[in-house]
């Protein structure tokens, strides 16, 4: 009987474990290349993928462009972005190019912006070559509060890589605030 | 104060070559990519080559693509139109113009005060 | 290549007047079109570019609006000076193409 009790305590704990894993929050958002925005220097992108092909979204909400955080706790955000230019893609005015990614914190309670993470470098994209590419990848680990928004800026949006494994973003909960 | 002052304009023959400079002053000029666009005589536009501000891209239309080549000269903050197997159709005010906005998506902010190319026997 | 149509080649307006100036793209330019203003005897100015925004030191009684392939340009209240041709002009992709012009005249 006691073998038997273990087994069942044994079995809830299991199905609360994974009943919990299942609710741990995630999301994993893929650039929508069809509404990529205007601009050189720091634009938003709110226009993302959050259930189709790689994008899935699990107890957070996307809303505005932004990933909105339902749950308090520790999370790890990353970012991936890609920048591209072949010589059929369009005219370049310039070679020289400021490729940079921003991922941003907002607050809605005490209304805040701050960057958490940012990343890139400077180029010279050159007419001799007929392809360029470049690649930037952030990832890093956060408290963040139920309520506060996740997005990305970046530089030269009209460069940016429109494949679903190349320009990404997301976050999943690592644990709780103590 | 941004400035673009073209030159060069003159009467031609059919068939023949002209070479238009425009003198950029006010601004970095090696940052910018610049353009030609010429104002045929019903006062229509028309783009007709683009150069990066590095100079190692150039773009053309149709039109004048294999005819028309655009330089610069970073160091004398000058642009060039070399215009050659010129048509009566090239018959145009040419203006030079600034690139501004960002990459493919690219507009004219500034524009010379032009200078005029006629062709005719 | 795409082609802008401004359908009206001339306009007449009186000043304090709102008036509207249409041009169609022949395929989507999302929201890439400029407006130029062109005074007699000068050459181009940038107005308006990424359909809605002014370029600097451009009064704010010239709006743009639009995306796609219908595009507006506005003057809220015209004045004198705003006797000129205007241009609008998609910057989407190469060639660059420009509309024919309205040219407005103050009554």
């Known amino acids: 009987i006691r073998a038997e009790k273990a087994m069942v305590d044994g079995s809830w704990l299991d199905l609360a474990k994974r009943s919990k894993l299942e609710a741990q929050p995630f999301a994993h958002l893929t650039i929508n290349a069809t509404d990529i925005p205007s601009g050189s220097h720091k634009v938003s992108l709110s226009s993302w993928y959050h259930d189709r092909g790689w994008a899935k979204i699990s107890n957070m909400t996307f809303s505005n462009g932004k990933l909105i955080v339902n749950q308090d706790g520790f999370y790890y955000l990353y970012a991936n972005i890609c920048f591209r230019h072949h010589e059929t893609s369009g005219d370049l005015a310039t070679e020289y190019l400021q490729l940079m990614v921003y991922v941003t914190k907002t607050s809605i309670k005490i209304p805040s912006s701050h960057t958490l993470m940012k990343g890139g470098s400077t180029k010279y994209w050159s007419g001799n070559s007929e392809f360029h590419f470049y690649s930037i990848n952030v990832g890093g680990f956060f408290k963040l509060r139920s309520g506060e928004e996740i997005s990305i800026e970046v530089s030269n949006p009209s460069l940016l890589d429109p494949d679903q494994d190349a320009t990404y973003f997301g976050a999943f909960k690592v644990r709780d605030i103590d | 104060e941004v400035q673009l002052v073209e030159s060069g304009g003159d009467l031609v023959k059919p068939g023949g070559s002209l070479k238009l400079s425009c003198a950029a002053s006010?601004?970095?000029?090696?940052?910018?990519?610049m353009s030609w666009v010429r104002q045929t005589p019903d006062k229509r536009l028309e783009w007709v080559a683009t150069i990066s501000s590095g100079g190692s891209y150039t773009y053309y239309p149709d039109s004048v693509k294999g005819r028309f080549t655009i330089s610069r000269d970073n160091a004398k903050n000058t642009l060039y139109l070399q215009m050659s197997s010129l048509k009566s159709e090239d018959t145009a005010m040419y203006y030079c113009a600034r690139l501004d906005g960002y990459n493919y998506r690219w507009y004219f902010d500034v524009w010379g005060t032009g200078t005029t190319v006629t062709v005719s026997s | 290549d795409i082609v802008m149509t401004q359908s009206h080649k001339f306009m007449s307006t009186s000043v304090g007047d709102r008036v509207s100036i249409t041009c169609k793209a022949s395929?989507?330019?999302?929201?890439?079109v400029a407006w130029y203003q062109q005074k007699p005897g000068q050459s181009p100015k940038l107005l308006i570019y990424s359909a809605s925004y002014r370029y600097t030191g451009v009064p704010d009684r010239f709006t743009g609006s639009g995306s796609g392939t219908d595009f507006t340009f506005t003057i809220s209240s015209v004045q004198a000076e705003d006797l000129a041709v205007y241009y609008c002009?998609?910057?989407?992709?190469?060639?660059?193409?420009f509309g024919g012009g309205t040219n407005l005249e103050i009554k």
């Open positions: 006010g601004f970095t000029f090696s940052r910018y990519g």
């Open positions: 395929q989507d330019v999302s929201s890439a």
């Open positions: 002009q998609q910057h989407y992709s190469s060639p660059r193409t």
